[in-house]
């Protein structure tokens, strides 16, 4: 008996061939001996089977002695043995229809679990192997689970169902809902305008939800909500914003926040959360603000940074075009009795400058100038 595997929702063509290359009498029936279809001369007639409106043949092939049974929009319950009777022979084809579906939705939040469920006909014992877009293989029986979805899991999952040495391939598009970056750091000189951007790693036609930015300033004992907003069909509207600082928010995606000026009291880290409509859980992006200030008070030139800096970052003070006078893995450095000239305060990571602030030291009889 020939075995044919089909996919739920697809179309399958079961073949039946006569030795005579001409249109002769044929008919297809199921294992319950119910007629599906047959011919009456050059015309096709359908039986009273459940397949009625989904069964078809190709009249153009009858003259060549081919009498296929085409079943459209396959269902699991179409799994059966189909019998073609032509001339004095019977051709039996066992059709096994499988379906593979993702749990509830194919749009999942980062960190959530993906469960793929295989629908299979009774009596079958298929094995399933799925390959994620990043090349990870998972195997299983009726269900396959992947916990802690990552951004790289977005894309087409290819799953192969194996039964009776035959295979059928399913492709499922999974969208992991996440921000493009889990975390970002913005380095700014005191007084500069700060731009925070929160680009999403996915695109959907309609995006609705609500969000909030909580901020933990380095100098503050507790975090506070800086802004809350709504998102409706990709349009952003601010619900509530603090007076200090008074953030501004872009009306379109990507989510964009502007802090009028960087001040030491704002340095710290924030957590932007976005709750999407019809989704349990929230998207998160961490954002960090590092603020630098260079000052000269009497005979002391000081450079300070506030905010979440890594211990390996180097803070330096140097006179322009000269070697660093002071360089430390600390958040404040100073030079006593600095020479006149343009001084540079540099925050660097392995030689790469992250933040730079210049301060002009005048001869001792005049006051310092900060450009």
């Amino acid at each position: 008996k020939k075995v044919v595997l089909g996919k739920k929702g697809d179309t399958v063509e079961l073949t039946c061939t006569a030795s005579q290359k001409k249109s002769i009498q044929f008919h297809w029936k199921n294992s319950n001996q119910i007629k599906i279809l047959g011919n009456q001369g050059s015309f096709l007639t359908k039986g009273p089977s459940k397949l009625n409106d989904r069964a078809d043949s190709r009249r153009s092939l009858w003259d060549q002695g081919n009498f296929p049974l085409i079943i459209k929009n396959l269902k699991i319950e179409d799994s059966d043995t189909y019998i073609c009777e032509v001339e004095d022979q019977k051709e039996e084809v066992q059709l096994l229809v499988f379906g593979l579906t993702a749990n509830s939705d194919t749009h999942l939040l980062q960190g959530q679990s993906l469960t793929l469920t295989l629908e299979s006909p009774p009596g079958s014992s298929p094995s399933v192997q799925c390959r994620s877009p990043r090349g990870k293989n998972i195997q299983g029986g009726k269900t396959l689970s992947v916990s802690q979805l990552e951004l790289q899991d977005s894309g087409t999952w290819t799953c192969t169902v194996l039964q009776n040495q035959k295979k059928v391939e399913f492709k499922i598009d999974i969208v992991v809902l996440a921000f493009q970056k889990a975390s970002s750091i913005v380095y700014k000189k005191e007084g500069e305008q700060v731009e925070f951007s929160f680009p999403l790693a996915f695109t959907v036609e309609k995006l609705t939800g609500s969000g909030e930015l909580w901020w933990q300033a380095e100098r503050a004992s507790s975090s506070k909500s800086w802004i809350t907003f709504d998102l409706k069909n990709k349009e952003v509207s601010v619900k509530r914003v603090t007076q200090d600082p008074k953030l501004q928010m872009g009306k379109k995606l990507p989510l964009h926040l502007t802090l009028p000026q960087a001040l030491p009291q704002y340095a710290g880290s924030g957590n932007l959360t976005l709750a999407l409509e019809a989704k349990t859980g929230k998207l998160h992006q961490e954002v960090n603000l590092v603020v630098m200030r260079a000052t000269q008070l009497q005979k002391n030139l000081t450079c300070e940074v506030w905010g979440p800096t890594s211990p390996k970052l180097m803070l330096s003070l140097k006179l322009e075009n000269k070697e660093a006078k002071v360089s430390k893995r600390e958040k404040a450095v100073w030079v006593l009795n600095p020479e006149a000239g343009m001084w540079q305060c540099l925050l660097s990571d392995s030689g790469q400058v992250l933040l730079e602030s210049n301060i002009k030291v005048l001869p001792t009889w005049s006051t310092p100038v900060q450009p």
């Epitope: 009498q25 009456q40 015309f43 009273p48 004095d88």
Partner: antibody, heavy 118, light 111 residues
Framework: QVQLQQSGPELVKPGASVKMSCKAS????????INWLNQRTGQGLEWIGE????????YYNEMFKGKATLTADKSSNTAYMQLSSLTSEDSAVYFC???????????WGRGTLVTVSA | DIVLTQSPASLAVSLGQRATISCKAS??????????MNWYQQKPGQPPKLLIY???NLESGIPARFSGSGSGTDFTLNIHPVEEEDAATYYC?????????FGGGTKLEIK
């Protein structure tokens, strides 16, 4: 020429069975389906079922399942219909018919009259 | 099952005139460009005789005064000009799907 010759009239008692025949000639018997239909006096036509003489596969109208049994004998080019547990409702003329090259029943037997009476 | 409704149940037509019989199906009997509707003539004591198959095809040996038309669910049998021998009962029948079903019949009387 194509001919379908049916057996003669039957007078049967309620509860009994009857088996009628339809002998085909003028064509290859296994190449065409034999259909069976009935017509009660002064009434319309009803399709009972069909038999594929080559394989012996028979298909029935739901209304006649359990009432009619269709068989065919390739050696004698004859199709048969047996009706069981007869009641007065089964009194009718029973036809065998074959399709032509088109969609309709082009060839008919003359019919077998079955009368069910005590 | 597909139900066929014929109208009128009976009609009387003068010799040489046109007789028109209608048949309405409960669902479409079309498939792949063909209409699976047939027309028969039956005289008392005789089996039905196939006149038209697949809505408009004249069966061999049937006079050209018989013609059929229609598609989907609405079909018509026309006889023109009507002759004396056309007095009979006419049936439509669908063969789109099993079970094949027949209309209730139209009795044609010649005036």
């Amino acid at each position: 020429q194509v001919q379908l010759q049916q057996s003669g009239p039957e007078l049967v008692k309620p509860g009994a069975s009857v088996k009628m025949s339809c002998k085909a000639s003028g064509y290859t018997f296994t190449d065409y389906v034999i259909n069976w239909l009935n017509q009660r006096t002064g009434q319309g036509l009803e399709w009972i079922g069909e038999i594929y003489p080559g394989s012996g596969s028979a298909y029935y109208n739901e209304m006649f399942k359990g009432k009619a049994t269709l068989t065919a004998d390739k050696s004698s080019n004859t199709a048969y219909m047996q009706l069981s547990s007869l009641t007065s409702e089964d009194s009718a003329v029973y036809f065998c018919a074959r399709r032509g090259t088109g969609t309709g029943f082009a060839y008919w037997g003359r019919g077998t009259l079955v009368t069910v009476s005590a | 099952d597909i139900v066929l409704t014929q109208s009128p149940a009976s009609l009387a037509v003068s010799l040489g005139q046109r007789a028109t019989i209608s048949c309405k199906a409960s669902q479409s009997v079309d498939y792949d460009g063909d209409s699976y509707m047939n027309w028969y003539q039956q005289k008392p004591g005789q089996p039905p005789k196939l006149l038209i198959y697949a809505a408009s095809n004249l069966e061999s040996g049937i006079p050209a005064r018989f013609s059929g038309s229609g598609s989907g669910t609405d079909f018509t049998l026309n006889i023109h000009p009507v002759e004396e021998e056309d007095a009979a009962t006419y049936y439509c029948q669908q063969s789109s799907e099993d079970p094949p079903t027949f209309g209730g019949g139209t009795k044609l009387e010649i005036k």
